[in-house]
Interface confidence: low
């Protein structure tokens, strides 16, 4: 009778993570008598996957009934495959021996390759806000995919970005891989509603890429522009001065009125109006009693936006020596000075 051969017909098997791998193995003879064992890898460091004779292997099931006397099919199924299961699996026939069974013949091996999906990309931006015209960096990370080949693209509002660097780790062969990419984005005043998108395409995703997003509203700070104007007089010897605070983001803003350098009133932006681009406008007014002042009055609107150094705009009210004679025509002029 011809000597027993162990046949593993599949040189390689490709399985998606989470699925079941079937590793086929048949023997050409019932002789010699002895169990079959499955190993991952060869040599002294090989890992036992299944032992027909003894042991508990919860993830492994046999394809046929190994208890039947004439069974020569030793194929197994391994459930819930992960990238860590990748490797070459050997079906090994042992000959009954005393005290221990003796390895008799091994199959040629079946290489199990695992396809694993990348995790959802996570996009993170800078820790501190930045103002328009500045360049900020965003990072995108995705993990756990296999095989290694992957495509990553960056977009800002649907427009593809080109200034980025990507690394896939590890460089060598591994059971699974991670991708890390850093993109540089130049901020504009219109970016409050903008989004940065990291898109990852992989063979396991079947043409439906994964996307991670970051809102630039969490990154951008648009400093306000200030305009101080004098409104028509409401009553004799009273002047209404308004401070228009325009196009700022985020909303956190505190305004202080100063009369000749002395604090007159401080308030926090509350009832703001929102512009189409996502920035805010706000207006504060100050009623000045001109008759209470002997000399010219320097009114300053000072704004502290989002914890940044204050910016200010001043307005000079010219107070006449004889205000009553001048009545409502009290001279006032806007110096247009913009102080930081």
């Amino acid at each position: 009778e011809e000597e027993l051969q162990v046949i593993q017909p599949d040189k390689s098997v490709l399985v998606a993570a989470g699925e079941t791998a079937t590793l086929r193995c048949t023997a050409t003879s019932l002789i010699p008598v002895g169990p079959i064992q499955w190993f991952r890898g060869a040599g002294p460091g090989r890992e036992l996957i299944y032992n027909q004779k003894e042991g508990h292997f919860p993830r492994v099931t046999t394809v046929s009934d190994l208890t039947k006397r004439n069974n020569m099919d030793f194929s197994i199924r391994i459930g819930n495959i992960t990238p860590a299961d990748a490797g070459t699996y050997y079906c090994v026939k042992f000959r009954k021996g005393s005290p221990d069974d003796v390895e008799f013949k091994s199959g040629a091996g079946t290489e199990l390759s695992v396809r694993a999906k990348p995790s959802a990309p996570v996009v993170s931006g800078p820790a501190a806000r930045a103002t328009p015209q500045h360049t900020v960096s965003f990072t995108c990370e995705s993990h756990g995919f296999s095989p290694r080949d992957i495509t990553l693209k960056w977009f800002k509002n649907g427009n593809e970005l080109s200034d980025f660097q990507t690394n896939v780790d590890p460089v060598g062969e591994s059971v699974s891989y991670s991708i890390h990419s850093t993109a540089k984005v130049v901020l504009t005043r219109e970016d409050v509603h903008s989004q940065v998108i990291c898109e990852v395409a992989h063979v396991t995703l079947q043409g439906d890429p994964l996307r991670g997003t970051a809102n630039l509203s969490e990154t951008i700070r648009v400093p306000p522009t200030l305009e101080v104007t004098q409104q028509p007089v409401r009553a004799e010897n009273q002047v209404n001065v308004t401070c228009q605070v325009r196009k700022f983001y985020p909303q956190r803003l505190q305004l202080t009125w100063l009369e000749n350098g002395n604090v007159s009133r401080t308030e926090t932006a509350s009832t703001v109006t929102e512009n189409k681009d996502g920035t805010y406008n706000w207006m504060s007014w100050l009623l000045v009693n001109v008759s209470a002042h002997r000399d010219d009055v320097k009114l300053t609107c000072q704004v502290e936006h989002d914890g940044q150094p204050a910016v200010s705009k001043s307005h000079d009210l010219k107070v006449s020596a004889h205000p009553k004679e001048q009545g409502s025509n009290t001279a006032a002029e806007n110096t247009g000075s913009n102080e930081r």
């Epitope: 040189k11 390689s12 490709l14 070459t88 091996g109 290489e111 390759s113 095989p147 080949d149 992957i150 495509t151 990553l152 693209k153 593809e160 980025f164 660097q165 990507t166 690394n167 896939v168 062969e173 990419s181 395409a201 063979v203």
Partner: antibody, heavy 119, light 107 residues
């Protein structure tokens, strides 16, 4: 149709550098890798490296590491291969080839650029 | 690095013959193997990718098989335009590598 148009033949002196361009058209440039392969006269094909046009990830053959630089310009849909410190044995035809992102086969090839290194 | 050994390095055949070229990888490469045809003075042309997938536009007389370490390219009923050099290429790991080539000549 999909095509790769390479720059013209070059004659260089030993120690010099050469930069070969490969203009892609007829497909989405950023959806593929671009490989560079060379063939010394009368010999076989030798892979030099690739650039993934989408994310600019680059991989060089260890044999050419430090001498070869592969870049790409997405706006011009063009890939470039620069080889420095040229020696006579670098005399070869240099091909660019579009690469698939999974199996890394090269399905579209440029016509090749002949680089002659001679003193 | 993975070495790819192609055999034979050359062969002579007649029109209508069935020709088989083999390629062996130094380690298992699953089905990450591709076949190319190159004619003198021309760029290589992809025939088969992923061991057995025929590239669009390539005649069906070309076929590929194999997995792991051993692969073959078969040309059924050789045609006059098939006389060329054929290369296999592994794309399992970098550096990507080509076989030494098989020159198919007219007998």
């Amino acid at each position: 149709q999909v095509q790769l148009v390479q720059s013209g033949a070059e004659v260089k002196k030993p120690g010099a550098s050469v930069k070969v361009s490969c203009k892609a058209s007829g497909y989405t440039f950023t959806s593929n890798a671009m490989h560079w392969v060379r063939q010394v006269p009368g010999q076989g094909l030798e892979w030099m490296g690739w650039i993934k046009a989408g994310n600019a990830e680059i991989k060089y053959s260890q044999k050419f590491q430090g001498r070869v630089t592969i870049t790409r310009d997405t706006s011009a849909t063009t890939a470039y291969m620069e080889l420095s410190s040229l020696r006579s044995e670098d005399t070869a035809v240099y091909y660019c080839a579009r690469g698939d992102y999974y199996y890394y086969y090269m399905d579209v090839w440029g016509k090749g650029t002949t680089v002659t290194v001679s003193s | 690095d993975i070495q790819v050994t192609q055999s034979p390095s050359s062969l002579s055949a007649s029109v209508g013959d069935r020709v088989t070229i083999t390629c062996r990888a130094s380690q298992s490469i699953s089905d990450f193997l591709n076949w190319y045809q190159q004619k003198p003075g021309k760029a290589p042309k992809l025939l088969i990718h992923a061991a057995s997938s025929l590239q669009a536009g390539v005649p069906s007389r070309f076929s590929g098989s194999g997995s792991g370490t051993d692969f073959s390219l078969t040309i059924n009923s050789l045609q006059p335009e098939d006389f060329a050099t054929y290369y296999c290429q592994q794309s399992y790991s970098t550096p990507l590598s080509f076989g030494g080539g098989t020159k198919v000549e007219i007998k």
